[in-house]
């Protein structure tokens, strides 16, 4: 059974996939940077802000060398899923207060979702272990005040910026191993 042996190349090689994932991560990093500048301009931050529900930074850039491809992609996917959930929450909970940051927040959410799809496709093509996402966390409580929401926005965008910066470095390093 079967067609004539041979079929045209229908989709990108995993190395090309990794290249386009790096490009997408870089553009998302730039989106986040611009959005952070806008947020600081409109709602100046008084120091650093934290949000307990955010993932801790996966790895220092210096420790990247020892990482394996599966652990980088699995951790990155889990962290980005968490940030996607936080951006969605932020847009729902702070719709009116942060409307000056739309449509940029919406674009960020769309691109984050696209990056997650790209990472999963890369893991499928390489046949790397795909751990199930963590069980759904309890719903995020609405911010106690407008200012509480703005502090949360600072924390989310700041954490996402650090994670994406780590991701670009990690993906570039992994490219050399593929």
């Amino acid at each position: 059974p079967g067609p004539p042996p041979g079929s045209p190349r229908a989709s990108p090689d995993p190395r090309a996939e990794l290249d386009s994932t790096v490009l997408l991560t870089r553009s998302l990093l730039e989106d986040t940077r611009q959005l952070t500048i806008q947020l600081k301009d409109k709602f100046p931050a008084d120091g650093d802000h934290n949000l307990d529900s955010l993932p801790t930074l996966a790895m220092s850039a210096g420790a990247l060398g020892a990482l394996q491809l599966p652990s980088v992609l699995t951790r990155l996917r889990a962290d980005l899923l968490s940030y996607l959930r936080h951006v969605q929450w932020l847009r729902r909970a702070m719709g009116s207060s942060l409307k000056t940051l739309e449509p940029e927040l919406g674009t960020l959410q769309t691109r984050l979702d696209r990056l997650l799809r790209r990472l999963q496709l890369l893991m499928s093509r390489l046949a790397l272990p795909q751990l199930p996402p963590d069980p759904p966390a309890p719903p995020l409580a609405p911010p106690s005040s407008t200012w509480g929401g703005i502090r949360a926005a600072h924390a989310i965008l700041g954490g996402l910026h650090l994670t994406l910066d780590w991701a670009v470095r990690g993906l570039l390093l992994l490219k050399t191993r593929l």
Partner: antibody, heavy 114, light 111 residues
Framework: EVQLLESGGGLVQPGGSLRLSCAAS????????MHWVRQAPGKGLEWVAV????????YYADSVKGRFTISRDNSKNTLYLQMNSLRAEDTAVYYC???????WGQGTLVTVSS | QSVLTQPPSASGTPGQRVTISCSGS?????????VHWYQQLPGTAPKLLIY???ERPSGVPDRFSGSKSGTSASLAISGLRSEDEADYYC???????????FGGGTKLTVL
Amino acid sequence: EVQLLESGGGLVQPGGSLRLSCAASGFTFSSYGMHWVRQAPGKGLEWVAVISYDGSYKYYADSVKGRFTISRDNSKNTLYLQMNSLRAEDTAVYYCAAGVPDYWGQGTLVTVSS
Amino acid sequence: QSVLTQPPSASGTPGQRVTISCSGSSSNIGSDYDVHWYQQLPGTAPKLLIYSNNERPSGVPDRFSGSKSGTSASLAISGLRSEDEADYYCAAWDSSLSGPVFGGGTKLTVL
């Protein structure tokens, strides 16, 4: 042009063994995870086993666990499936497939019968 | 019995739009794993038709489209043609099996 060419199929008695091979060309074999998927006559597709791009991860369907072994030789652009303790229900066309799977071979028929 | 559930058959007349469903569970489609669709023409090997829920490989006509919601996915074929008569399979990664799972297949007949 991507090519995946399976070989090694044939008629074997229950309890016997076979080794399938899949020769790949036209793409960077060492960058792709590789699968074996089978199709019993007149039935649907059943995933059998997968091996990661570098051979460090291997997963098997419950129906073949402990009997089949997937392996690859990236220097030869070849995928293998060692099948032991074969049963009548293993009778199928065995396809080698790359990636998602994105690409499929033409299949090789394995018949287990006395 | 397949882990992903598809209707065994579907049919339509030339030019019509036909939809094929694929139902999964929380360990596969519902776990945010992507769904892929394959077309198997009579006597041939399967061919990737849709990947990552709604992406088309180069060479696949835009008459074919995919979507996903919750624990289900669907394949839509518009402007049905006689050459679309084939078996269609959905597939997704399953975390409980640590591997991909296929639907049982849907035989599409063009009347």
